[in-house]
Interface confidence: low
């Protein structure tokens, strides 16, 4: 038993650190292997992963780790019973995947204006609490090609556009994913989508 | 100005109990490691304990893991020992300290130290 | 646990001298070291870190060296508030622990 693809990791930066890594055949991930979890420095003990299958040689363990800080670094040990298989490092805050936003939610009873709000995913004793900035697709059920993407650079999870933006009369697709600048993280997964009926008053015609 | 002010230090029999504080000002005492470490009278430095900055994680030496409990609260930017059953060879001046980094390393602010005589 | 042997015990050295202390792990403890000044009835105050690392408002007459488990801590003329008693310190394997010390007075 060998690993092909050694595992990479990334971080929520909050609680959860999830690994990845592919064997050289399939394998039962969660009785055959075990990844072992330590941080360098004193302040815990060695904990055990135990790996789901992710297709048929690939293998993901979900990390648990507590207050997670920008210094912390972890020795990684994947054991297939008493051999070991692969030995590695992780440093959480430099392979940082945000948690997605929640609860997006459509404001339609603005007149003439879209409210789009959702939740912050950190607790706000959480470094990233202050740090994420958004990105909000909005698209067309019915037209593929009416695709758009704002950007939401500043720290409210909120997003105002005008309904005239959007064709009325038809129904859209909203969702949301966050990143933080600080810690060069990739995207977080997008948000559930919300749906809405897009509908505004046109304005009367200038004569 | 950083200060660090230990307190609750005296004379104990042994098999008693002590509880010191340090009083923390002049910094982000809810974002910082904080530990305490002792030296006994002419002698050394030893690492006693430490603790991250949500008091999540606890670390301490053998000497006295079970006796000795390390705690905070951020509210009052305060961090406590709580000493019990202790020895003889506990006698020593116990000073607070940050660590440098968010992680157990160098030490760059200390307290001036509380001394803490364990004796019959 | 890493044990920190740290050379000499004692010195005694003249104002002006150029002075190094030594300090041995008994394990690589990579830069995970620091150097500390304690003055007699003070607390230890923080020189050097990362073992090469000026620690902040510390006079450049302080130095640091080293990695794995030889580290040397010098100060290249010896002042008469430099008398004190010098720690190192590992803080890479667990517990941290601490050099002897080595007490450094004036000719």
């Known amino acids: 038993m060998k690993v092909l693809q050694e595992p990479t990791c990334v971080s929520d930066y909050m609680s959860i650190s999830t690994c990845e890594w592919k064997m050289n055949g399939p394998t039962n991930c969660s009785t055959e292997l075990r990844l072992l979890y330590q941080l360098v420095f004193l302040l815990s003990e060695a904990h055990t992963c135990i790996p789901e299958n992710n297709g048929g040689a690939g293998c993901v363990c979900h990390l648990l780790m507590d207050d997670v800080v920008s210094a912390d670094n972890y020795t990684l040990d994947l054991w297939a019973g008493q051999q070991l298989l692969w030995k590695g490092s992780f440093k959480p805050s430099e392979h940082v995947k945000p948690r997605a936003p929640g609860n997006l939610t459509v404001h339609t009873n603005v007149s003439d204006t879209l409210l789009l709000t959702w939740s912050n995913p950190y607790p706000p004793d959480n470094y990233l609490y202050n740090h994420l900035t958004y990105a909000v697709n909005i698209w067309s059920e019915n037209d593929p090609a009416d695709f758009r993407i704002y950007n939401v650079t500043y720290l409210e999870p909120s997003l105002r556009i005008a309904a005239s933006t959007l064709k009325s009369g038809i129904s859209y697709r909203a969702r949301v994913r966050a990143w933080a600048q600080c810690y060069n993280t990739t995207w977080s997964e997008w948000s559930p989508s919300t749906k809405w009926h897009n509908s505004y008053r046109e304005p009367f015609e200038q004569h | 100005e950083v200060q660090l002010v230990e307190s609750g230090g005296g004379l104990v029999q042994p098999g008693g109990s002590l509880r010191l504080s340090c009083a923390a000002s002049g910094f982000t005492f809810s974002s910082s490691y904080m530990s305490w470490v002792r030296q006994a009278p002419g002698k050394g430095l030893e690492y006693v304990s430490a603790?991250?900055?949500?008091?999540?994680?606890?670390y301490y030496a053998d000497s006295v893991k079970g006796r000795f409990t390390i705690s905070r609260d951020n509210s009052k930017n305060t961090l406590y020992l709580q000493m019990s059953s202790l020895r003889a060879e506990d006698t020593a001046v116990y000073y607070c300290?940050?660590?440098?980094?968010?992680?157990?390393?160098?030490?760059?602010?200390w307290g001036q130290g509380t001394s803490v005589t364990v004796s019959s | 646990d890493i044990q920190m042997t740290q050379s000499p015990s004692s010195l005694s050295a003249s104002v002006g001298d150029r002075v190094t202390i030594t300090c041995q792990a008994s394990q690589d403890v990579s830069t995970a070291l620091a150097w500390y000044q304690q003055k007699p009835g003070k607390a230890p105050k923080l020189l050097i870190y990362s073992a090469s690392n000026l620690e902040t408002g510390v006079p450049s007459r302080f130095s640091g060296s080293g990695s794995g488990t030889d580290f040397t801590f010098t100060i290249s003329s010896l002042q008469p508030e430099d008398i004190a008693t010098y720690y190192c310190h590992q803080y890479y394997g667990s517990p941290p622990t601490f050099g002897g010390g080595t007490k450094l007075e004036i000719k």
């Open positions: 603790i991250n900055s949500n008091g999540g994680k606890t």
């Open positions: 300290t940050r660590q440098r980094g968010n992680y157990v390393g160098a030490m760059d602010y």
